[in-house]
Amino acid sequence: IWELKKDVYVVELDWYPDAPGEMVVLTCDTPEEDGITWTLDQSSEVLGSGKTLTIQVKEFGDAGQYTCHKGGEVLSHSLLLLHKKEDGIWSTDILKDQKEPKNKTFLRCEAKNYSGRFTCWWLTTISTDLTFSVKSSRGSSDPQGVTCGAATLSAERVRGDNKEYEYSVECQEDSACPAAEESLPIEVMVDAVHKLKYENYTSSFFIRDIIKPDPPKNLQLKPLKNSRQVEVSWEYPDTWSTPHSYFSLTFCVQVQGKSKREKKDRVFTDKTSATVICRKNASISVRAQDRYYSSSWSEWASVPCS
Amino acid sequence: RAVPGGSSPAWTQCQQLSQKLCTLAWSAHPLVGHMDLREEGDEETTNDVPHIQCGDGCDPQGLRDNSQFCLQRIHQGLIFYEKLLGSDIFTGEPSLLPDSPVGQLHASLLGLSQLLQPEGHHWETQQIPSLSPSQPWQRLLLRFKILRSLQAFVAVAARVFAHGAATLSP
């Protein structure tokens, strides 16, 4: 058993049929010695008396808020949550496996630049009685600070018969060094509590590996005289690290016909313009990637040929 | 060329060669991004590689103030990786494919380090850890880790030379 926060405790349970329960001794936080009684949750029934209460925690029915009282006055509370371990593996019932980029990916994180700011998100089908708490650091043995905000519900979508809820959190490294080569990964730890179930999820990454620039901005076409060619130009996204002479991007320009089956013409360039042939009913799209490190491409910025 | 006394390197040449290094490092092991090598436990190899750190002056302001600190750090790293790529980690079993970019990568590391330090001038170089993994699978894992680390190192080096070429060239 360990303390998650004040008056909230997590009981770690081996979850197999013939596992014995965990013996837990609750102590009433009071100088009083006599006349103390214990109750659970909303029930007024007395579960035991005395300054300590020894319980066996085996089921979710044994978890909950234990309260000690004296003469009708509440003295203290202890909320017990359960963390299940099945076949040596901690349960992951609360969050959905996103399966990208690999199985058992519960947290996904992205950064728009090298400033040390990043966003993580996760999915669940649970809509109520759900709380998240996020902590992060650079490295684990001698951790350096990363400050995370509160996790918020960022999207809801319907998947078949189920509703899926997306939560996200923004974090910022306290003393970020955008130009340095990272040697210690960022660690992100999410505590998830659903009713009386506790789970924790972690992700470890370098900012450089989760970079995904915003799409290029101000995408414009300039027809070239007496030609089917056009000059496409664009700018670095506002959110990209500066100076651009140091934090450079490379770009992919694509000409795509109306039909998905039509051959796509692609040009790669380090410049912020390119000359392409603009077919009727086609569209021109441009996306960006770090020039020197192959992290994710941005989403496409698009403009119609006409 | 970077003279330890303080004259500027051939920024444009260094830019071109460092960008080529980036391309080669990724073609040497493109899928490495999909493997979480940190899960395999960080052995001393990747712990001992020289990283370009915050105080090394490789940020735009540091380069403007005095690029020598940063260039020396980059040089150290290039020599370190050049020696690693020439070691039995890469020359031993399992043999690299004949068309593997590792050979070109090795030569380009040497080329860039020579651009930074001509004959007769010596910056101190970092000691290479003595690594002789016994099993072929260990060697393979070590290669992945070294290439992964090299990708990050040459990315910073390439940024430095690109910025230098754009803003510090005479």
Epitope: D18, G21, L40, G48, Q56, E59, G61 | -
Partner: antibody, heavy 119, light 107 residues
Framework: EVQLVQSGAEVKKPGESLKISCQSS????????IGWVRQMPGQGLEWIGI????????RYNPMFRGQVTMSVDKSSSTAYLQWSSLKASDTAMYYC????????????WGQGTMVTVSS | EIVLTQSPATLSASPGERATISCRAS??????LAWYQQKPGQAPRSLIY???NLQSGIPARFSGSGSGTDFTLTISSLEPEDFAVYYC?????????FGQGTRLEIK
């Protein structure tokens, strides 16, 4: 006052189905799991299983798994034990009981339902 | 599963006497053992939990002791209403199991 009131005695033929009930009152129904115990004529007590009234989480005695089904209706604070096809060997007194949280024993019992299966 | 063996199977005693019933487990159940009393035609009634804790409303003449594998229920001075069948039950490991029962009869 805590009360567990069980449905009346049943006489059934082999192969028939049956659902007996146990209605709780006088306490917070969702705080306490409900269990079932069998007592065959002239015999001792046998633990069938327990069930959460919150999410219908169930722990069956392997000996009874597949033989009986436990269920619960939160809205009426009622627990059920059912059989899809009775056998003569199911003849017994069935007790529902309230599981004490933080312990696991049964602190309050229903009066019992006698089930007789005979052709 | 854990087997609980009660002894004796039948105990004959007179009102006012001390009665002791033993319950032995086939493996340790820590202190997670309860005692119940059942009278003819009635449901069992909880007497003792956690090996030695008296259930609310049960007379103080009933007491329990033991831990691990050996447990005892003691009735210090028998009253006429105490003649019944007594069961021990372990609730440490599923499936929870009962002893076969001890019949306490009037001598």
């Amino acid at each position: 006052e805590v009360q567990l009131v069980q449905s009346g005695a049943e006489v059934k033929k082999p192969g028939e189905s049956l659902k007996i009930s146990c209605q709780s009152s006088g306490y917070s129904f969702t705080t306490y799991w409900i269990g079932w115990v069998r007592q065959m004529p002239g015999q001792g007590l046998e633990w069938i299983g327990i069930m959460s009234p919150v999410d219908s989480d169930i722990r069956y005695n392997p000996m009874f798994r597949g033989q009986v089904t436990m269920s619960v209706d939160k809205s009426s604070s009622t627990a059920y034990l059912q059989w899809s096809s009775l056998k003569a060997s199911d003849t017994a007194m069935y007790y529902c009981a309230r599981r004490r949280p933080g312990q696991g024993y049964f602190d309050f019992w229903g009066q019992g339902t006698m089930v007789t299966v005979s052709s | 599963e854990i087997v609980l063996t009660q002894s004796p199977a039948t105990l004959s005693a007179s009102p006012g006497e001390r009665a002791t019933i033993s319950c032995r487990a086939s493996q340790s159940v820590s202190s997670w053992l309860a005692w119940y009393q059942q009278k003819p035609g009635q449901a069992p009634r909880s007497l003792i939990y956690s090996a030695s804790n008296l259930q609310s409303g049960i007379p103080a003449r009933f007491s329990g002791s033991g831990s691990g594998t050996d447990f005892t229920l003691t009735i210090s001075s028998l009253e006429p209403e105490d003649f019944a069948v007594y069961y021990c039950q372990q609730y440490n490991i599923y499936p929870y199991t009962f002893g076969q029962g001890t019949r306490l009869e009037i001598k």
